[in-house]
Amino acid sequence: IWELKKDVYVVELDWYPDAPGEMVVLTCDTPEEDGITWTLDQSSEVLGSGKTLTIQVKEFGDAGQYTCHKGGEVLSHSLLLLHKKEDGIWSTDILKDQKEPKNKTFLRCEAKNYSGRFTCWWLTTISTDLTFSVKSSRGSSDPQGVTCGAATLSAERVRGDNKEYEYSVECQEDSACPAAEESLPIEVMVDAVHKLKYENYTSSFFIRDIIKPDPPKNLQLKPLKNSRQVEVSWEYPDTWSTPHSYFSLTFCVQVQGKSKREKKDRVFTDKTSATVICRKNASISVRAQDRYYSSSWSEWASVPCS
Amino acid sequence: RAVPGGSSPAWTQCQQLSQKLCTLAWSAHPLVGHMDLREEGDEETTNDVPHIQCGDGCDPQGLRDNSQFCLQRIHQGLIFYEKLLGSDIFTGEPSLLPDSPVGQLHASLLGLSQLLQPEGHHWETQQIPSLSPSQPWQRLLLRFKILRSLQAFVAVAARVFAHGAATLSP
């Protein structure tokens, strides 16, 4: 058993049939010594008396809010949550496996630049009685600070018969050093509580591996005289790290016909302009990637050829 | 060329070669199958690699003030990785794929380190970890880790030389 926060405790249970469970001793936070009784949740049934209560926690029915009283007055509460371990593996019932970039990916994170700011998100099908708390650090043995905000519901989607809820959180490394080569990964820890079930999820990454620039901005076409060619130009996204002579991007320019089956023409360039042939009804798209480290490409920025 | 006395390197040449190094490092190990390195053991070889840290002066401001600290750090790393790529980890069993660019990568690391430090000038180089052969089955994992680490190192080096070529070239 361990304390998650004040008056909230997590009991770690091996979850198999006929498991003996965990013996837990609760102590009433009071100077009083006698006349103390204990109840669980809204029930008025007295579970025991005395300053301490010993219980055998085996299942969710044994978890909940234990309250000690004296003469009708509430003295203190202890909320017991359960963390299930089945076949040696902690349960992951609350969050959905996003399966990208590999199985058992529950948290996904992205950064728009090297400033030390990043966003993580996760998915669940649970809509009520759900709370999250997020902690993060750089490194684990001698952790350096990363400050995370509160997790918020950022999207709702219908997937078949189910509703899916996306939560996200923004974090910022306290003393980020954008130009340095990271040697210790960022660790993100999410505590999830659904009713009386506790689970924790972690992700470990380098900012460089989760970089995904915003799409290029101000995408423009300039027709070239007496030619089907056009000059496409664009700019670095505002959110990208500066100076651009140091934090450089590379770009992919694509000419795509109306039909998805039509052959795509692609050009790769380090410049912020390119000359391409504009076909009728086609569109021109440009995306960006870090020039020197193969992290994710940005989403496409597009303009029609006409 | 960067020399301990403080003259400038051939920024443009260094920029071209460091960008080539980035391409080679990624073609030597594209991120396929996404192995989570932090779940694996055998850390000792990759823990000792020289990283370009915050105080090494490789940021734009630090390069403007005095690029020598940063160039020395980059040189140190290039020599370190050049030794690792020539070590048993890469030259031993199991064989690399026939068209593996590791040989080219090895030669380019040496080429860039020589651009930074001509013969006769000696910066202190970091101690190379023991190159005694690990068991062959450990090597694929070590190769993977070293190449991933090298990708990060050469990315910073390439940014330094690109910025130097754009803003510090005579």
Epitope: - | P94, P133, P136, L141
Partner: antibody, heavy 114, light 112 residues
Framework: EVQLVQSGAEVKKPGASVKVSCKAS????????MNWVRQAPGQRLEWMGV????????TYNQKFKGRVTITVDTSASTAYMELSSLRSEDTAVYYC???????WGQGTLVTVSS | DIVITQTPLSLPVTPGEPASISCRSS???????????LNWFLQRPGQSPQLLIY???TRASGVPDRFSGSGSGTDLTLKISRVEAEDVGVYYC?????????FGSGTKLEIK
């Protein structure tokens, strides 16, 4: 084209030493370790040791307890295997094989006889 | 040292028929990188060994697809789907998981 060309057959007396050479061509000599393997008449193949041509680091089969020494001359792209304190059971064909074992020398017959 | 036990010692086969050779390792050759560190060779009379299969199941360059390798970490098999006259010789398996590398005792394939 990758080629490993070994030195010619040798006849040695018991207690003597033999040094077999293996000249490599068609690839960058320092990019690949070189193994040495032997095969006594009618016997299975037996791995003797390996050398990293970059640094000269070696790993030997303990069966040969200090009797085997593998060296390289990188300027000549040549690997050498020396076996000392020869006995009659060392009569065998000795092969060099590049890392990966896809390329082998043609073999060198060493006969130990009084 | 890892001991490799190879069977059978001799294998008479009719051309066009399949053939199978087994090697058993005293220690698993499958490691956490998912690779199984076993090679198969053919040594024709008077020649140097020729690599057929590496990493248990990958055919070496120029090796016909009638040769295939499979197995678990300890029990490994070389199969020839249809034996041809040119396949005669001694077949060896070799582990390259740990030093010293060790070979099987060999299987002599002959045409009936």
């Amino acid at each position: 084209e990758v080629q490993l060309v070994q030195s010619g057959a040798e006849v040695k007396k018991p207690g003597a030493s033999v040094k077999v050479s293996c000249k490599a061509s068609g690839y960058s000599f320092t990019d690949h370790n070189m193994n040495w393997v032997r095969q006594a008449p009618g016997q299975r193949l037996e791995w003797m040791g390996v050398i990293n041509p970059n640094y000269g680091t070696t790993t030997y089969n303990q069966k040969f307890k200090g009797r085997v020494t593998i060296t390289v001359d990188t300027s000549a792209s040549t690997a050498y295997m020396e076996l000392s304190s020869l006995r009659s059971e060392d009569t065998a064909v000795y092969y060099c094989a590049r890392r990966g074992f896809a390329y082998w020398g043609q073999g060198t017959l060493v006969t130990v006889s009084s | 040292d890892i001991v490799i036990t190879q069977t059978p010692l001799s294998l008479p086969v009719t051309p066009g028929e399949p053939a199978s050779i087994s090697c058993r390792s005293s220690k698993s050759l499958l490691y956490k990188d998912g690779k199984t560190y076993l090679n198969w060779f053919l040594q024709r009379p008077g020649q140097s060994p020729q690599l057929l299969i590496y990493l248990m199941s990958t055919r070496a360059s120029g090796v016909p697809d009638r040769f295939s390798g499979s197995g678990s970490g300890t029990d490994l098999t070389l199969k020839i789907s249809r034996v041809e006259a040119e396949d005669v010789g001694v077949y060896y398996c070799q582990q390259i998981a740990e030093y010293p590398f060790t070979f099987g005792s060999g299987t002599k394939l002959e045409i009936k």
